[in-house]
């Protein structure tokens, strides 16, 4: 049935970039300026997206494809097809309702977007802090305190007594 209908429907012959004009005996007419049709057989053309204000044009609209927008410097895209532009912050900051705020102590953000995240807790992996964290950078974990040097055992609790010949795990 679908195939039969498409043979009888003159609109199915209208290619992308045109529309089937009912006012002109279903002739395929080109999309008017600032509009497009990305598929064939369309009865109308869609209005081109306008990249206004904080949005800038990444790709111009053509008769067969919509315009694509991105954000002006200082902002980044959010959402499908860059439906929103969100303010950038500096590294070491996060965006709040009241603008960019520095990361609290113990947290960091190494990007211009997103939220401040807690520093890695090296001790959870049995490691020590090799390089302290900052607002912009996470801590760097090093080897476990016991592996650092022979003298390091003084800062770690004594290991339980073991049979001779057994090394610590």
């Amino acid at each position: 049935f679908e195939r039969t209908r498409s043979l009888q429907d003159p609109c199915s012959n209208c290619p992308a970039g045109t529309f089937c004009d009912n006012n002109r005996n279903q002739i395929c007419s080109p999309c008017p300026p600032n509009s497009f049709s990305s598929a064939g057989g369309q009865r109308t053309c869609d209005i081109c997206r306008q990249c206004k204000g904080v949005f800038r044009t990444r790709k111009e609209c053509s008769s067969t494809s919509n315009a694509e927008c991105d954000c002006t410097p200082g902002f980044h895209c959010l959402g499908a097809g860059c439906s929103m532009c969100e303010q950038d912050c500096k590294q070491g900051q996060e965006l709040t309702k009241k603008g960019c705020k520095d990361c609290c102590f113990g947290t960091f953000n190494d990007q211009k977007r997103g939220i401040c995240r807690p520093w890695t807790n090296c001790s959870l992996d049995g490691k020590s802090v090799l390089v302290n964290g900052t607002k912009e950078r996470d801590v760097v974990c090093g080897p476990s305190p016991a592996d650092l040097s022979p003298g390091a055992s003084s800062v770690t609790p004594p290991a339980p007594a073991r049979e001779p010949g057994h090394s610590p795990q």
Epitope: K52, F55, C85, E86, K97
Partner: nanobody, 121 residues
Framework: QVQLQESGGGLVQPGGSLRLSCAAS????????IGWFRQAPGKEREWVSC????????YYADSVKGRFTVSRDNAKNTVYLQMTNLKPEDTAVYLC??????????????WGQGTQVTVSS
């Protein structure tokens, strides 16, 4: 008809002042933040300033801090950008937009067409 309209642009000498207006019609400006942007010939569009709807707190680009002041008169449905100590590098088309929030703009926000500011001796 819902629209934003900028006015107040013109030619001014370096060191001079101008006050731009961003007037809304067809909607209540008091519900929206207002952001100001500018675009100089051959340059990227640049964020200038924004004023929040809730508490009228204002934010400024480093390049205009201390020289530009943004304010709002919700009764007149208008936001103002007072520009002082103008420099030739302030020459641009200035436009305003009405997001819900200074930090986030949507593709369906209202925008004006812009007003030309030229700073030259």
């Amino acid at each position: 008809q819902v629209q934003l309209q900028e006015s107040g642009g013109g030619l001014v000498q370096p060191g001079g002042s101008l006050r731009l207006s961003c007037a809304a019609s067809g909607f209540s400006l008091g519900l929206y933040a207002i952001g100001w942007f500018r675009q100089a010939p051959g340059k990227e569009r640049e964020w200038v300033s924004c004023i929040m709807s809730s508490d009228s707190s204002a934010y400024y680009a480093d390049s205009v801090k201390g020289r530009f002041t943004v304010s709002r008169d919700n009764a007149k449905n208008t936001v103002y950008l007072q520009m002082t100590n103008l420099k030739p590098e302030d020459t641009a088309v200035y436009l305003c937009g009405a997001p819900r929030d200074c930090s986030r703009y949507s593709s369906d926000d209202y925008w004006g067409q812009g007003t030309q500011v030229t700073v030259s001796s």
